[in-house]
């Protein structure tokens, strides 16, 4: 039984220009991360394997930078870089848990943090 | 006591086919990612590739993808390197290696490859 | 790929002698380095894993530090068991990479 949950920054949003750091936690389950992958729609950006350590996908290597943790930054933000991001836990022996969160690119200076929130 | 062997090494003519072996004990094999790691006389050590211990997933260094798959039966702890389309610069020490938190823990003793005409 | 350089290439130093291996990276890769040991006919051997953790049964005469860029191997007193070639290896960025290797000698 899957008893693990994802915990993500949510909905965020940012400024046109600047950057902003996507971040996931798994708790409450004692399963081993074997790979995290962040996807954008349906574009693999990056991957950290346990053992390996990152790939980042060749059409964002220049603004698309590992970390903190298991997180990711994306950088020089451009309003196509609004949409829905996740975060993609493959584990074992639970198998796959997927966190979402929404990044707003905005053009104004009025960008701020949106809540945390949990996705079973 | 961990302990990884390797076979299957061996003289081959370029352009030809070789498998390698490595059997693992002393470990709970379906939970490590193993790798292969080779080494040209003389010279220093290179990553080959990779397989994930449960979703079966590789990843392969730029210099053997598309010739190379690693592959691995968990019912009978063992790992494989199937080589094809070997070339002069395969020759190598194969050495299948446990990983473990970035680093690789353990090697076996590795196994000699010889691609020559 | 990240390029690992290590140096010197090779040195002679005497039983008892504190030696001191550098390696470093193209790009940070935070601590994600690795040190392995290795003799002539045998397979490497894992010494330091994440920059200065010893792994399990090394000697801790034998250390590691750094982050970032640059990384240090020493072992604090050579004993004739460390005559051998070092590695250095990171795991940040897929594929791995490893340095060319620092050959220990007896002067």
């Known amino acids: 039984m899957m008893t693990g949950t994802i915990e993500t920054t949510g909905n965020i949003s940012a400024e046109k220009g600047g950057s902003i750091i996507l971040q996931c936690h798994l708790s409450s389950t004692t399963a081993q991360v074997t790979q995290v992958n962040w996807e954008q729609q349906d574009q693999l950006l990056a991957i950290c394997n346990a053992d390996l350590g990152w790939h980042i996908s060749p059409s964002f290597k220049d603004r698309v930078a590992p970390g903190p943790g298991l997180g990711l930054t994306l950088q020089s933000l451009t309003v196509n870089d609004t949409g829905e991001y996740f975060c993609i836990y493959h584990t074992y022996p639970d198998g796959t848990y997927t966190g979402r969160i929404f990044l707003e690119v905005l053009e104004s200076s009025v960008a701020e943090h949106g809540a945390r929130f949990q996705i079973p | 006591e961990v302990q990884l062997l390797e076979s299957g090494g061996g003289l081959v003519q370029p352009g030809g086919s070789l498998r390698l072996s490595c059997a693992a004990s002393?470990?709970?094999?379906?939970?490590?990612?193993v790798s292969w790691v080779r080494q040209a006389p003389g010279k220093g050590l290179e990553w080959v590739g990779y397989?994930?211990?449960?979703?079966?997933?590789?990843y392969y260094a730029d210099s053997v993808k598309g010739r190379f798959t690693i592959s691995r039966d968990n019912s009978k702890n063992t790992l494989y390197l199937q080589m094809n389309s070997l070339r002069a610069e395969d020759t190598a020490v194969y050495y299948c290696?446990?990983?473990?938190?970035?680093?690789?823990?353990?090697w076996g003793q590795g196994t000699l490859v010889t691609v020559s005409s | 790929d990240i390029q690992m350089t290590q140096s010197p290439s090779s040195l002679s130093a005497s039983v008892g002698d504190r030696v001191t291996i550098t390696c470093g990276a193209s790009?940070?890769?935070?601590?994600?380095l690795n040190w392995y040991q290795q003799k002539p006919g045998k397979a490497p051997k894992l010494l330091i894993y994440?920059?200065?953790s010893l792994h399990t049964g090394v000697p801790s005469r034998i250390s590691g530090s750094g982050s970032g860029t640059d990384f240090t191997l020493t072992i604090s007193s050579l004993q004739p068991e460390h005559f051998a070639t070092y590695y250095c290896q990171q795991s940040y960025i897929i594929p791995p990479t490893f340095g060319q290797g620092t050959k220990v000698e007896i002067k």
């Open positions: 397989i994930n211990p449960s979703r079966g997933y590789t």
């Open positions: 790009q940070t890769i935070e601590r994600r």
């Open positions: 290696a446990r990983s473990y938190g970035g680093g690789f823990d353990y």
């Open positions: 002393g470990f709970t094999f379906s939970n490590y990612g």
């Open positions: 994440d920059a200065s």
